[in-house]
Amino acid sequence: EDELQVIQPEKSVSVAAGESATLRCAMTSLIPVGPIMWFRGAGAGRELIYNQKEGHFPRVTTVSELTKRNNLDFSISISNITPADAGTYYCVKFRKGSPDDVEFKSGAGTELSVRAKPSAPVVSGPAVRATPEHTVSFTCESHGFSPRDITLKWFKNGNELSDFQTNVDPAGDSVSYSIHSTARVVLTRGDVHSQVICEIAHITLQGDPLRGTANLSEAIRVPPTLEVTQQPMRAENQANVTCQVSNFYPRGLQLTWLENGNVSRTETASTLIENKDGTYNWMSWLLVNTCAHRDDVVLTCQVEHDGQQAVSKSYALEISAHQKEHGSDITHEAALAPTAPL
């Protein structure tokens, strides 16, 4: 009579996380008498998965009724598979012995690989804002996927980015993997409304990739441009000097007027206007009584933006000889009542 063979027909089985895995095993003979066991791994450190004779294995069910007379099918199903269940499973026949059963023959093994979806990618930007023309880094991370093969792409404003580095860890075999990618993005003045997108494609996702986004508005600082001009006035003894603060982002702004180097008034008058590109404009103006001045006046508009070093623009207000003769006290009038700093 031919000696018993343990047949595991599938060399490998791939299962999605959360599903059940069926591991097939058949014997060619009923002899010798003795139980079968399933193990994960081989050698001394192997892990018992199922013992026909005894024990409690809540996730394991047998495909056939093992106690049925002449049964040769010892296939099992393992429920609620996780990446930690990956490995090679061996169906092993034992011969009845005393006091212990003796291992008789093992199947060739079935490798169980678990397909697990990557987590939603998380994109994070730089800790501090940078100005246009500078390069900032964005990172994208996703975890818990298997198999290791994965595709990651970066996009900005309709274009795929090419300046990025991606690592999948660990380098060797593992139950699940993580991906980390860093993209370098050169900021432009128009990036207030821009987004970077990290896209992950994996076999478990099939039709729809996973995407994570970050807004460049969190990473960019567009410094303002300043222009100080004198507006024509009806009254001969008044000058209207305006400070136009243009195209800045974010909106945090403190404006101060200096008169010949001395603080004249901290201004936050006018209305904040948002431009199409997401930057802001702001205007402040002074009404200066020219009769009050015997000499020319240098008016300086000083702007502190987003906690950065102040920038300023000056304007020399010429006082005519006629006005110098008829001087009186200076009065400054803001066209609008000042509000709190932006």
């Epitope: 791939s14 999605a16 595709t151 274009n159 076999i203 996702l205 099939q206 039709g207």
Partner: antibody, heavy 120, light 107 residues
Framework: QIQLVQSGPELKKPGETVKISCKAS????????MHWVKQAPGKGLKWMGW????????TYAEDFKGRFAFFLETSASTAYLQINNVKNEDTATYFC?????????????WGQGTSVIVSS | DIQMTQSSSSFSVSLGDRVTITCKAS??????LAWYQQKPGNAPRLLIS???SLETGVPSRFSGSGSGKDYTLSITSLQTEDVATYYC?????????FGGGTKLEIK
């Protein structure tokens, strides 16, 4: 070579159920999504949704939530579209189409289409 | 949902003509655009994916261009076998959406 072969034409009365099959060959069935597309007579193409053949998850376009269901018979590499309680407006040709993955989620291979006529 | 607009529903053309079919998305689709050709009674056939990549077996007289929201399918010299309806489709977001189609007819 890659092929998607759909079941034959169906004539149904309003209120009945229709089940269309799409048998795939020439590739690993569970590696690619399966999409379904409707084309009413003389009209354009309308995406109905897709089935993740690996996980079994279904995604339906808004207009196809409720009476429409996608099924799989993985062992037979076959996808199914079932329409319950059919209405006259379901009269159309229905296509299955394989969806790629990686950098290309395009529908690259299509079935020949199954004509469904709903008439009392 | 992303709307896909093919401005011309039909074109009357002569054999040998250069034909340009346009497709506009309601938002940026990051070049995830496909062009399909469908002849009466047949299933659609994929011509171009990724806005510009010609599929294997598609004649070189077909080409795709565009980015952002605006895309174009061009046929350099129209042949008899090119008479069909052409659909654009975005696959950047679900639901996948098709343009209304552009039917080419011979003058």
């Amino acid at each position: 070579q890659i092929q998607l072969v759909q079941s034959g034409p169906e004539l149904k009365k309003p209120g009945e159920t229709v089940k269309i099959s799409c048998k795939a060959s020439g590739y690993t069935f569970t590696d690619y999504a399966m999409h379904w597309v409707k084309q009413a007579p003389g009209k354009g193409l309308k995406w109905m949704g897709w089935k993740n053949t690996e996980t079994g998850e279904s995604t339906y376009a808004e207009d196809f939530k409720g009476r429409f269901a996608f099924f799989l018979e993985t062992s037979a590499s076959t996808a199914y579209l079932q329409i319950n309680n059919v209405k006259n407006e379901d009269t159309a040709t229905y296509f299955c189409a394989r969806g790629g993955y990686g950098s290309n989620y395009v529908m690259d291979y299509w079935g020949q289409g199954t004509s469904v006529i709903v008439s009392s | 949902d992303i709307q896909m607009t093919q401005s011309s529903s039909s074109f009357s053309v002569s054999l040998g003509d250069r034909v340009t079919i346009t497709c506009k998305a309601s938002e940026d689709i990051y070049n995830r655009l496909a062009w399909y050709q469908q002849k009466p009674g047949n299933a659609p056939r994929l011509l171009i994916s990724g806005a510009t990549s010609l599929e294997t077996g598609v004649p070189s007289r077909f080409s795709g261009s565009g980015s952002g929201k605006d895309y174009t399918l061009s046929i350099t010299s129209l042949q008899t076998e090119d008479v069909a309806t052409y659909y654009c489709q975005q696959y950047w977001n679900s639901p996948r959406t098709f343009g209304g189609g552009t039917k080419l007819e011979i003058k």
